[in-house]
Interface confidence: low
């Protein structure tokens, strides 16, 4: 018979015959012949293959490397990748997320709309008209101003958006 | 029991160099990343070398104050570490601490030391 | 290179007294990266207190880490005369790795 030009799926064409690729988690150790299949072996630990494959050498693990504010999300298997993730406080700066940063925190007249993920930075939005924030944060919001009448106040000093209004004693005539 | 043993100190003259070495024994070795620290005499502490395991392909690092003049490796079969030192200084004069560095995922610190062994540089 | 600045360098204190010492790095780490360390005279260093507040091992509980950013300490909460060491701060966070410059405490 002819030989083949082209291999079914999870084979590969060698010296003119289709050989098994070697499965997720396994690396070729010998092609296959006339007379034998295609020889695997197991990836060994901190290692791994994630396809269907005829690699003779396993992948490394990535390693979530501290000095990069990295950490395990999760662990690698023989057929998958270590995930890193951030250090809290910090995001990465990439989506293979190969290194991290602190997250930014909002100024004073600014608060948070959004905290901040393991993969995304913090948002800011300036404080509107009758909100404040007087802190530098990566977690406040703006806060209301405080309703003076509520407390049968009254407004002494107007707030801003990066102070709160300041509430008296009303004025009583006498009598 | 974990065990940490340094030799190889001694006095040695200015220009010259040494081999310092670290047996050990009592916990896994083979994974751990494995560091030299110094100190001299009345001083404080100084990291100096660290070599990681087979995982990371034994990469290796340096402090940059003896950058070229260093080498630092590793013999998993017999659970050693090894710190050459080259062109010796007066300043290179301190006990050597050889230390293992714990890692989890989370964080690094130095978990087992050596007793140390005391180099001295002098003519 | 972070620079981690310790103080006291030196402090003498009375058995039963609260001590502090505190660590102050040049640049923001995570607390995950800060490290103390005690040394007895004579002796090799080991590991007190690891990611600014988990105790060691075998550490007695009156010891005790906090902090944050760049500001870190070891709080001993009643001082003892086993106590007499020096004490280091360390960062993992970036290579070099680096120590404080070592607190000494002394009992009076």
């Known amino acids: 018979p002819e030989p083949p030009t082209a291999c079914r799926e999870k084979q590969y064409l060698i010296n003119s015959q289709c050989c098994s690729l070697c499965q997720p988690g396994q690396k070729l150790v010998s092609d296959c012949t006339e007379f034998t299949e295609t020889e695997c072996l197991p990836c060994g630990e901190s290692e791994f293959l994630d396809t269907w494959n005829r690699e003779t050498h396993c992948h490394q693990h990535k390693y979530c490397d501290p000095n990069l504010g990295l950490r395990v999300q999760q662990k690698g298997t023989s057929e998958t990748d270590t995930i890193c993730t951030c250090e809290e406080g910090w995001h990465c700066t990439s989506e293979a997320c190969e290194s991290c940063v602190l997250h930014r925190s909002c100024s004073p007249g600014f608060g948070v709309k959004q905290i901040a993920t393991g993969v995304s930075d913090t948002i800011c939005e300036p404080c509107p008209v009758g909100f404040f924030s007087n802190v530098s944060s990566a977690f406040e919001k703006c806060h209301p101003w405080t309703s003076c009448e509520t407390k049968d106040l009254v407004v002494q000093q107007a707030g801003t958006n990066k102070t709160d209004v300041v509430c008296g004693p009303q004025d009583r005539l006498r009598a | 029991e974990v065990q940490i043993l340094e030799t190889g100190g001694g006095l040695v003259k200015p220009g010259g160099s040494l081999r310092l070495s670290c047996a050990t024994s009592g916990f896994n070795f083979n994974d751990s990343f494995m560091n030299w620290v110094r100190q001299a005499p009345g001083k404080g502490l100084e990291w100096v070398a660290q070599?990681?395991?087979?995982?990371?392909?034994?990469?290796?690092y340096y402090t940059e104050s003896l950058e070229g003049r260093v080498t630092i490796s590793r013999d998993d079969s017999k659970s050693r570490v090894y710190l050459q030192v080259s062109s010796l200084r007066a300043e290179d004069s301190a006990v050597y601490y050889c230390t293992s560095y714990y890692y989890d995922g989370f964080a690094d610190y130095f978990d087992y030391w050596g007793q140390g062994v005391m180099v001295t540089v002098s003519s | 290179e972070i620079v981690l600045t310790q103080s006291p360098t030196t402090m003498a204190a009375s058995p039963g007294e609260k001590i502090t010492i505190t660590c102050s790095a040049s640049s923001s780490i995570s607390s995950n990266y800060l490290h103390w360390y005690q040394q007895k005279p004579g002796s090799s260093p080991k590991v007190l207190i690891y990611r600014t507040s988990n105790l060691a091992s075998g550490v007695p509980v009156r010891f005790s880490g906090s902090g944050s950013g760049t500001s870190y300490s070891l709080t001993i909460g009643t001082m003892e005369a086993e106590d007499v060491a020096t004490y280091y701060c360390?960062?993992?966070?970036?290579?070099?790795?680096?120590f404080g410059g070592g607190t000494k405490l002394e009992i009076k």
């Open positions: 360390q960062q993992g966070s970036s290579i070099p790795y680096t």
């Open positions: 070599i990681r395991n087979k995982n990371y392909n034994y990469a290796t």
